[in-house]
Interface confidence: low
């Protein structure tokens, strides 16, 4: 079978991949060699992690590795007629595309001296045990398989591929996803460092919901031993987030307006360089022996150097490469550290801000806060959340539980609010009476009144007619009957203007005049409630229609 | 408010040297980054120079690098222009700027004019 | 350095009118374009951030398009109010660049 699932490490100026399938060491190194590399070489220490660090990823997305031990090849091969010869650290192998002896080995036992025929390496991984960087990979010598014999293979192999330089990952200021597609033809979108003539793919945004912005950008050689994207800033800038997403994709500082806008900056010491977010020691070596982003600080009188890391790095054991420490592990924030390249961040859980004593504190937000609050009207801090309110007459509504909505209490649940006429008003309602009757001082009652007449008015003009709108806008009262127990209303009156006595102890309007000058009414045809004869009228009385309502300063017409 | 208020502009002779001031106030000075923009008498409106937050990175534009050079007092809520070996085509309004999203807040501008 | 070219140079309308204002830049900015408003008499002011991200304040008549090269503002019924110069200028890579204007003015 071919080459299936791979994983991928880059790391200085080497990318390695890992591959399962049942191929002959042979047919491992044609795979490796069509995509322009070789069966991994393992030179050092160092080489032997980044090697362990690809198996670990291969094998974490592959389940059909079910054998206690596995074997993956390695360019590690002696030649038939070439004999071991014990007095090397390679024991007479040499590594596939050439390279000088090397002095790290790491055979897994003794090995039998046998010159017949050609031995292949393979590195030795126990599945039972966890991978660790104390624990690396054992090398095993033997056959080197035959091609198209999948039964006498072993399980997979490691390619590595070698390039001038990388460029740096791109940095994301915004929510979006990153497709790196490596001269090697593998996809990935979290690369450590992505190889020479590398193409990304950026598509902006956090999913369905947004529409996405696509950005192509390919991995080029801006100077000597200089890589770059030839992009400027952080992408897929969001003021949403500010610098709190991936440090707004700022290599060392970010530094937020108020407004969510951001900028990158760098420390003393370092500028900023063009790309707008990577910083650069102020002072470089002209030569620069280092690499990985060391920086090459010269010693007294010019003579000598020594590499430098950025703060949240550190040398390795070359003491010419800088790894990115795990600042996370000394848990230096009260509630979430994300580990960045050179650092880390604190961040702090929904509902709560950057602040508070000591670094990487977090306190609660208060979305209540004048100017900043989500509610509609009333609005409570709790820590980490908060929730709406609203003032009587209304209920929640939106779908997030912040806007206030009108409650139509003449349509209400708890039944009719009024013995005959209801008008609903925002926030509110009034009753009302049909002509020849007044409102009680309950407010909610009729009791027989003076009948004027005057001139019949019918509905409002058209251009008081409209929808019912939000809790923003003003209201129209409008008039509903109140129902009788069959549900049915028993009689439509018509309206006219009011012409009541100067002594008469309530105010009245017609229907029209209730609504605010300018804004959107609803006109409903008001009709009589059945009720019972203790409790208003039963028939009107007469034929004048004037409506009186009580005044919104009237307290039994009100919740 | 955000108020950024400029100063210091005037009639100056050719290869002579002004320095244009900018009270700001509103807004916490220390945490922005702020420019300065210049509008010729054409209406062209050309970014001259940006000083990071806290004074240690300035941008300047290519015509203008080694001439001016932009500085801020933080204590003062101040940001500064120092110009000098002036030339013809630095006849403009210099505006005021603070750094967001874009130039999110201006000044009135002050006017500099170089005569022979 | 990158140009912006900005085009009409003027615009003649009438209040009502609706119009879409174009901004070319010489490569590609990403989104990392803004435009500005400015009055006769008056200091510019910012109107649309990232091509197409309104600000508070700014009348929702306002809007952005455009990624990459091609950018356009677009006006939703011209008030008398909105006559002036329009400034496009990108964020995208030093030296931070305007475009040249386009001028509204009333037919």
């Known amino acids: 079978t071919g080459a299936d699932t791979e994983a991928v490490v880059c790391v200085g100026t080497a990318c390695y991949t890992a591959h399962s399938g049942k191929l002959s060491a042979a047919e491992a190194q044609n795979h490796c060699n069509q995509n322009g590399g070789n069966l991994a070489t393992v030179k050092s220490k160092e080489e032997a992690q980044h090697v362990q660090r690809v198996l670990a990823q291969l094998l974490r997305r592959e389940a059909a590795l079910t054998a206690r031990m596995s074997k993956f090849w390695i360019g590690l091969q002696r030649e038939k007629g070439k004999c071991l010869d014990p007095s090397l650290p390679l024991k007479g192998f040499s590594w596939v595309g050439g390279g000088e002896d090397t002095p790290y080995s790491n055979w897994h036992k003794e090995l039998r001296n046998s010159c017949i025929s050609k031995r292949c390496v393979s590195l030795l991984l126990d599945l039972s045990q966890p991978l660790l960087p104390s624990r690396l990979p054992k090398w095993s010598e033997g056959p080197c398989g035959s091609p198209g014999s999948p039964g006498s293979n072993i399980e997979g192999f490691v390619c590595k591929f070698s390039f001038k330089g990388m460029c740096r990952p791109l940095a994301l200021g915004g929510p979006g996803q990153v497709t790196y597609t490596t001269p090697f033809q593998t996809t990935s979108s979290s690369l450590e460092a992505v190889p020479f003539a590398s193409a990304a793919n950026v598509a902006c945004g956090e999913g369905d919901k947004d529409e996405t912005q696509s950005h192509y950008f390919l991995c080029k050689e801006k100077a000597p031993d200089v890589f770059d994207w030839g992009s400027s800033g952080p992408l897929c800038v969001s003021p949403k987030y500010g610098c709190n997403f991936n440090n707004g994709g700022c290599h060392q500082d970010c530094f937020e307006g108020g407004d969510g806008s951001f900028l990158c900056g760098c420390r003393p010491g370092f500028r900023l360089l063009d790309d707008l977010v990577t910083c650069a020691s102020r002072n470089p070596c002209s030569s620069s022996p280092c690499r990985g982003g060391a920086t090459c600080v010269l010693g007294p009188h010019g003579k000598n150097y020594t590499c430098r890391c950025p703060q949240g790095y550190q040398l390795d054991s070359s003491q010419l490469d800088c790894v990115d420490v795990d600042e996370c592990q000394d848990s230096p924030c009260a509630q979430e550290c994300v580990n960045t390249p050179g650092g880390f961040r604190c961040e702090c859980w929904v509902g709560y801000e950057p602040g508070g004593p000591g670094e990487g504190a977090c306190q609660d937000v208060d979305e209540c806060a004048l100017g900043r609050s989500p509610c509609a009207q009333g609005c409570t801090n709790t820590d980490g959340s908060f929730h709406c309110s609203c003032e009587e007459g209304y209920v929640l509504a939106g779908e997030d539980g912040t806007q206030c909505q009108d409650v139509d209490e003449c349509v209400g649940p708890g039944g009719p609010l009024c013995d005959s006429l209801c008008f609903n008003t925002q926030g509110s309602f009034h009753c009302g009476c049909l002509p020849g009757w007044v409102l009680a001082p309950n407010g909610v009652s009729c009791t027989m009144g003076p009948v004027s007449l005057g001139p019949p008015s019918g509905p409002p003009d058209e251009e008081d007619k409209g929808e019912k709108e939000g809790s923003t806008v003003p209201r129209a009262a409008t008039a509903s009957p109140t129902r009788g127990p069959e549900g049915t209303p028993k009689a439509t009156p018509t309206t006219s203007r009011p012409s009541l006595s100067s002594d008469a102890p309530i105010t009245s309007a017609p229907l029209k005049m209730l609504a605010p000058s300018g804004s959107p009414g609803v006109w409903r045809e008001p009709s009589i409630h059945h009720a019972t004869a203790a409790s208003g009228p039963q028939e009107p009385a007469g034929g004048d229609s004037s409506v009186a309502t009580q005044n919104n300063d009237g307290t039994d017409g009100q919740k | 408010d955000v108020n950024l208020v400029e100063s210091g502009g005037g009639l100056v002779k050719l290869g002579g040297s002004l320095k244009l001031s900018c009270a700001a106030s509103g807004f916490t000075f220390s945490n922005y980054y702020m420019s300065w923009v210049r509008q010729s008498p054409e209406k062209r409106l050309e970014w001259v120079a940006t000083i990071s937050n806290n004074g240690d990175s300035t941008y300047y534009l290519d015509t203008v690098k080694g001439r001016f050079t932009i500085s801020r007092d933080s204590a003062e809520n101040t940001l500064y222009l120092q110009m000098s070996s002036l030339i013809s085509e630095d006849t403009a309004v210099y505006y005021c700027?603070?750094?967001?999203?874009?130039?999110?807040?201006w000044g009135q501008g002050t006017l500099v004019t170089v005569s022979a | 350095d990158i140009v912006l070219t900005q085009s009409p140079a003027t615009l003649s309308v009438t209040p009502g009118d609706s119009v879409s204002l174009s901004c070319r830049a010489s490569?590609?900015?990403?989104?990392?374009l803004h435009w500005y408003q400015q009055r006769s008499h008056e200091s510019p002011r910012l109107l649309i951030k990232?091509?197409?991200q309104s600000i508070s304040d700014i009348p929702s008549r306002f809007s952005g398009s455009g990624s990459g090269t091609d950018f356009t503002l677009s006006i939703n019924s011209i008030e008398t109010e909105d006559f002036g110069m329009y400034f496009c200028q990108q964020s995208n890579s030093w030296p931070l660049t305007f475009g040249a204007g386009t001028k509204l003015e009333l037919k």
């Open positions: 700027t603070r750094v967001g999203t874009g130039f999110t807040y």
């Open positions: 490569q590609s900015i990403n989104n990392y």
């Open positions: 990232f091509a197409s």
